[in-house]
């Protein structure tokens, strides 16, 4: 018995930031769990991790170097990734590991959700405004 | 059939570390289904579980101890690790590993102990 | 922390005899009607072993002298007839929540 996971396909970081949700077929109400994002096709990189509890506040840590928050809902948790690169655009994939009570209960790999990391292009105002028109 | 069989205890000096290894078989500590867990036993007291990992590789903690513990495992040996830092003498125990299936987590297989005693 | 109870911490019984050994949980181990509380026997110098799982089922290759009940906070293991093997130690513990716990234990000696 697996949990299924829905991302956005894509999403696009214009000011690098983005919020990434993770919705799940399973309701995490009153459950013990460890939801995380992973970079990359392999999922090699653990991007952030939230960490639930019946009797704690939510845990929401990144041992990867990630500016990032997190917000439980009933059945999603959303990721919150701030300053973001250019070079981090990528494919990430949400994942959830239910612990307490048993079962134990994980999901099936998701489509992922590709997260495009648009730079900031500030123009500089000119120094000499050009002549205004009549 | 399922197998445990835990090795490296001994005496050691308070303030040390410990590494106590679990070699199972009969089953893949890789595979769905089934976790491990180590527990321990101060002479003559009761049972304190010290922590689980399961088959993704998702270590689990008992909150008083997790600030000395990390679990790990090698697939290849089909192993599982127990590293123990700063002991003290109230860390002399038998120290088990015990399988747990996922359904209910009652730990149906446990290996036969390892003594570990801390003193100086 | 989930603590649980036993009692009674010991208890000299005679073979044959019918043994019931209580277990409370601070709260309740019930979910979705299952209950997350598991019973084992252990003898000096051996591994606990175990012998009832989700408060009533039987564990397989233990006699069915062994049997369990209870739900929510309190739970029961019986032996309905003492046998020379029986006398050890037996403990309960919960799986409900995060950290799993355990009883002190209930010694069993021969009287």
């Known amino acids: 018995n697996k949990i299924l996971v829905k991302q956005s396909p894509m999403l696009v970081a214009y000011d690098n930031a983005v919020n990434l949700s993770c919705k799940y077929s399973y309701n995490l109400f009153s459950r013990e769990f460890r939801a995380s994002l992973h970079k990359g096709l392999d999922s090699a990189v653990e991007v952030c991790v939230v960490y639930g509890n019946y009797s704690q506040q939510l845990q929401v840590y990144s041992k990867t170097g990630f500016n990032c928050d997190g917000k439980l809902g009933n059945e999603s948790v959303t990721f919150y990734l701030q300053n973001l690169y250019v070079n981090q655009t990528d494919i990430y994939f949400c994942k959830i590991e239910v612990m307490y009570p048993p079962p134990y209960l994980d999901n099936e790999k998701s489509n992922g959700t590709i997260i495009h990391v648009k730079g900031k292009h500030l123009c500089p105002s000119p120094l000499f405004p050009g002549p205004s028109k009549p | 059939e399922v197998q445990l069989v835990e090795s490296g205890g001994g005496l050691v000096q308070p303030g040390g570390s410990l590494r106590l290894s679990c070699a199972a078989s009969?089953?893949?500590?890789?595979?769905?289904?089934?976790?491990v867990s180590w527990i321990r036993q101060a002479p003559g007291k009761g049972l304190e579980w010290i922590g689980s990992?399961?088959?993704?590789?998702?270590?689990y903690y008992n909150p008083s101890l997790k600030s000395r513990v990390t679990i790990s495992r090698d697939n290849s040996k089909n192993t599982l690790y127990l590293q123990l830092n700063s002991l003290r003498a109230e860390d002399t125990a038998v120290y088990y590993c015990?399988?747990?299936?996922?359904?209910?987590?009652?730990?149906?297989?446990w290996g036969q102990g390892t003594l570990v005693t801390v003193s100086s | 922390d989930i603590q649980l109870t036993q009692s009674p911490s010991s208890l000299s019984a005679s073979v044959g005899d019918r043994v019931t050994i209580t277990c409370r949980a601070s709260?309740?181990?019930?979910?979705?009607?299952?209950?997350?509380l598991h019973w084992y026997q252990q003898k000096p110098g051996k591994a606990p072993k175990l012998l009832i799982y989700?408060?009533?089922s039987l564990e397989s290759g233990v006699p069915s002298r062994f049997s369990g009940s209870g739900s929510g906070t309190d739970f029961t293991l019986t032996i309905s007839s003492l046998q020379p093997e029986d006398f050890a130690t037996y403990y309960c513990?919960?799986?409900?929540?995060?950290?799993?716990?355990f009883g002190q234990g209930t010694k069993v000696e021969i009287k």
């Open positions: 015990a399988r747990y299936e996922y359904d209910y987590y009652a730990f149906d297989y």
């Open positions: 009969g089953f893949s500590l890789s595979t769905g289904g089934v976790g």
């Open positions: 990992i399961y088959h993704s590789g998702s270590t």
């Open positions: 709260q309740s181990v019930d979910f979705y009607g299952k209950s997350f």
């Open positions: 989700a408060a009533s």
């Open positions: 513990q919960q799986s409900y929540r995060s950290p799993p716990t």
